[in-house]
């Protein structure tokens, strides 16, 4: 808190300009009118204030707008945004994407702060859904943004927004998140031809079911091992050796290096050894020849 003191003679601020950087904190408090500050917020970011001085200016705005700042002020906060608490931000109603971009710019190159997380939450809730322009903006500033959302939050992403997603945006997504995103991506890219479709859908395949993987295996897609290793184990297990060979194409040789890791390890255990031998990779651990394989899950479903 800055104590209330009278403004010294001749120091009353008539406009927000660079002369104010030479004011002591108490002088800023006493000599800068909050309404003047609010109308000239666009000048503040260009003036080399210290954060201590910005704290004083924030205090003045807080007194002027106890219920939360109007968007006309928020849009021009600049580095003053760094002095806001999540509690401050929860009082705001931010509707303009330009305002969001301006504030994200201040935090650019740094991890998402609690302030930014609150701002994004307020913005998205205000919009009702995560539209393409918003998603474009958020993933540009925070590539991991999408994977920070819960499956429930991701369900509000319209399929049209999926076009904004880049492969690196999905790097930290877990299977539950990909389960939600994959059907949206499938819908979004459904009108593309085979090879183009695969390029777009590839990063989402961690959420693909068995039948879609079987369909892909018929399209000469040559899936790389890194993508294969991210597939759902339960989706890979029912694939035959022939289907996996078609799915991976020339990359099938990479299975040997991954034979001890999921999902390859679990898939090997489900295949007949003589089928595995046809690959010529020396994969071991399949079902020995002559053994009868009972699929108990099918038996339970029938009874």
């Amino acid at each position: 808190e800055v104590e209330k003191t009278a403004c010294p003679s001749g120091k009353k601020a008539r406009e927000i300009d660079e002369s104010l950087i030479f004011y002591k904190k108490w002088e800023l408090e006493a000599c800068v009118d909050a309404a003047l500050l609010a109308t000239q917020m666009d000048r503040v970011n260009a003036i080399p204030f210290t954060y201590e001085q910005l704290d004083v200016l924030k205090h003045k705005l807080d007194e002027l707008y106890p219920q939360g700042y109007p968007e006309s002020v928020i849009q021009h906060l600049g580095y003053l945004f760094l002095k806001m608490s999540p509690e401050d931000i929860r009082k705001w109603n931010v509707t303009s994407l330009e305002t969001l971009k301006a504030l994200l710019e201040v935090n650019k190159g740094h991890e998402m702060s609690p302030q930014v997380a609150t701002l994004i939450d307020r913005f998205v809730k205000g919009r009702g859904q995560l539209d393409k322009d918003t998603l474009d903006t958020l993933t540009a500033f925070y590539p991991g943004y999408l994977c920070s959302l819960s499956p429930e939050e991701l369900s509000s992403v319209p399929p049209s927004s999926i076009w904004a997603v880049r492969p690196q945006d999905l790097d930290t997504c877990d299977p539950r998140q990909l389960d939600v995103l994959y059907p949206k991506a499938r819908l979004a890219f459904q009108n593309m031809n085979g090879s183009e479709y695969f390029v777009k859908i590839q990063s989402f395949l961690g959420g693909a079911p068995t039948e879609d993987l079987k369909a892909l295996s018929q399209q000469n897609v040559s899936m790389d091992l890194a993508t294969f290793m991210k597939l759902r184990t339960d989706a890979v297990l029912p694939l035959t050796v022939a289907e996996v060979q078609k799915l991976l194409g020339p990359h099938v040789e990479g299975l040997k290096a991954e034979e001890r890791h999921r999902p390859v390890r679990d898939w090997i255990l489900r295949q007949r050894q003589d089928d595995l031998d046809t690959l010529g990779l020396g994969l071991q651990g399949g079902i020995p020849n002559g053994y009868l394989v009972l699929d108990l899950s099918m038996q339970e479903a029938l009874s």
Partner: nanobody, 116 residues
């Protein structure tokens, strides 16, 4: 975190000169360049002079024409040349800057006393 170390303070007679130095322990990433501040006994901290990232200099009215701020990037050092010193310039002088994350940084200060 980059350290700021001021030096060059001392006792000087009115009308005399001093040159303060502020050495940084590494490259600083400052939002508002580097400033020289001072705090007289019982008074608030005030900015005396600032040199922005683009080299622009700014001075408080009370020191204009007497003090000069400059920097030597190769030595990671900022200077304050103080001429025609007056008793009212007596204070602890600090260098400081603001980063891009919401924090102000200050050195430990150097005492300047102007007295006959």
């Amino acid at each position: 975190q980059v350290q700021l170390v001021e030096s060059g303070g001392g006792v000087v007679q009115p009308g005399g000169s001093l040159r303060l130095s502020c050495a940084t322990s590494g490259t600083i990433f400052s939002r508002n360049g580097m400033g020289w501040f001072r705090q007289a006994p019982g008074k608030g901290l005030e900015l005396v002079a600032r040199i922005l990232n683009d080299g622009t200099t700014m001075y408080a009215d009370s020191v204009k024409g007497r003090f000069t701020i400059s920097r030597d990037n190769s030595k990671n050092t900022v200077y304050l040349q103080m001429n025609s010193l007056k008793p009212e310039d007596t204070a602890v002088y600090y260098c400081g800057y603001s980063d891009y994350r919401g924090t102000d940084y200050w050195g430990q200060g150097t005492q300047v006393t102007v007295s006959s």
